[in-house]
């Protein structure tokens, strides 16, 4: 926070994890820094060690409990501090009053599987991971399919405006290798963002029957 621009961004996975990134132009790579979490209405405090992810950027995960435990609610405020060691003392570099359900980023969907595949279509299902029961059905998904000779960035996005943990891909080419990814986002939260993309699921359409299109 001394020289250059500084940025401290955190997201809550809706259950028991707050992931933070702190970036600081001109900061020393070998400085020892931590994120401290101090909730306003909970008995616990939590700390994580910031580790370098790039030249001027550090990240860490505040593990608040077991993965599926509901550690925070929409009324909680958690004061988050970046503290860096300077000699024998700790110095506060960045601070924010973090509202967890205004800053959501869920875990990537998991357990992707092909339910049924044909020559021109494929039905795929997935599961959401560590998502709060508070959302009920208030989630949306984006999906994309990687076709041969294209990149993920070129893949058109398919939007599912409801909590639907499956999709039927149509107009596929027979006997062709594809990959599929999906991501999830709660409808709640001013600064909420998409989860990371799921691990790609590779599948192959069935070959066309001989003598047919």
């Amino acid at each position: 926070a001394v020289n250059g621009t500084s940025r401290f961004t955190c997201f809550y996975n809706s259950r028991a994890n707050i992931s933070c990134v702190w970036s600081q132009d001109g900061a020393l790579q070998d400085t020892s820094c931590q994120v401290h979490a101090w909730p306003d209405r909970r008995r616990w405090n939590q700390t994580c060690e910031l580790l370098p992810v790039s030249q001027a950027s550090w990240a860490c995960n505040l593990i608040l409990g077991t993965p599926d435990s509901q550690k925070l609610t929409a009324v909680d405020i958690v004061t988050l501090r970046v503290m860096c060691r300077e000699g024998v003392r700790w110095r506060m570099m960045a601070i924010q009053d973090f509202k967890p359900f205004e800053n959501l980023r869920l875990m990537a969907p998991i357990s992707l599987q092909v339910v049924h595949v044909e020559t021109h279509r494929c039905n795929i299902s997935w599961k959401i991971s560590q998502a709060s029961h508070y959302f009920e059905r208030h989630l949306e998904f984006e999906a994309r399919t990687l076709s041969p000779g294209h990149t993920w960035e070129e893949a058109p996005l398919m939007t599912l405006k409801q909590k639907q943990e499956w999709i039927c891909l149509e107009t596929l080419t027979p006997d062709t290798q594809y990959e599929f990814q999906v991501r999830v986002k709660p409808l709640q939260g001013e600064f909420t963002t998409w989860s990371p993309w799921s691990q790609p699921l590779a599948f192959r359409t069935k070959p066309a029957a001989l003598g047919k299109d």
Epitope: A1, S6, D40, T79, W90, M92, A94, I95, Q96, D97
Partner: nanobody
Framework: QLQLVESGGGLVQTGTSLRLSCAAS????????MGWFRQFPGKEREFVAA????????VYVDSVKGRFTISRDNAKSTVYLQMNSLKPEDTAVYYC???????????????????WGQGTQVTVSS
């Protein structure tokens, strides 16, 4: 480095007003939030009030809400504490403080502030 110098303290009667000033010099462009703490004899310093870099956010300890007002003039690199309806229990040494850390909270602690003035005595007699 950054220096903070308080002024405006003194001896006043219960129910009257006083305005503390704190002038910053040195690397003032580094300053983000500024605030006031106070220390009673034999006690730890306690938070009184803080103000964000642009003056848009302020926070006060419950015991001074509605009586004290914090403000700042960035052009003069000065922060003020207007103290009205003073009480004998407001008697303390008042310290100006500043941080170059980014961000804002409503829950400031002593350790959050890296820069401190020498303090100015405020005595409220009954």
């Amino acid at each position: 480095q950054l220096q903070l110098v308080e002024s405006g303290g003194g001896l006043v009667q219960t129910g009257t007003s006083l305005r503390l000033s704190c002038a910053a010099s040195g690397h003032t462009s580094r300053i983000n939030a500024m605030g006031w703490f106070r220390q009673f004899p034999g006690k730890e310093r306690e938070f009184v009030a803080a103000i964000s870099r642009n003056g848009g956010s302020t926070v006060y300890v419950d015991s001074v809400k509605g009586r004290f007002t914090i403000s700042r003039d960035n052009a003069k690199s000065t922060v003020y504490l207007q103290m009205n309806s003073l009480k004998p229990e407001d008697t303390a040494v008042y310290y100006c403080t500043a941080t170059d850390a980014v961000g804002w909270t409503t829950r400031w602690m002593t350790a959050d502030f890296g820069f401190w003035g020498q303090g100015t005595q405020v005595t409220v007699s009954s």
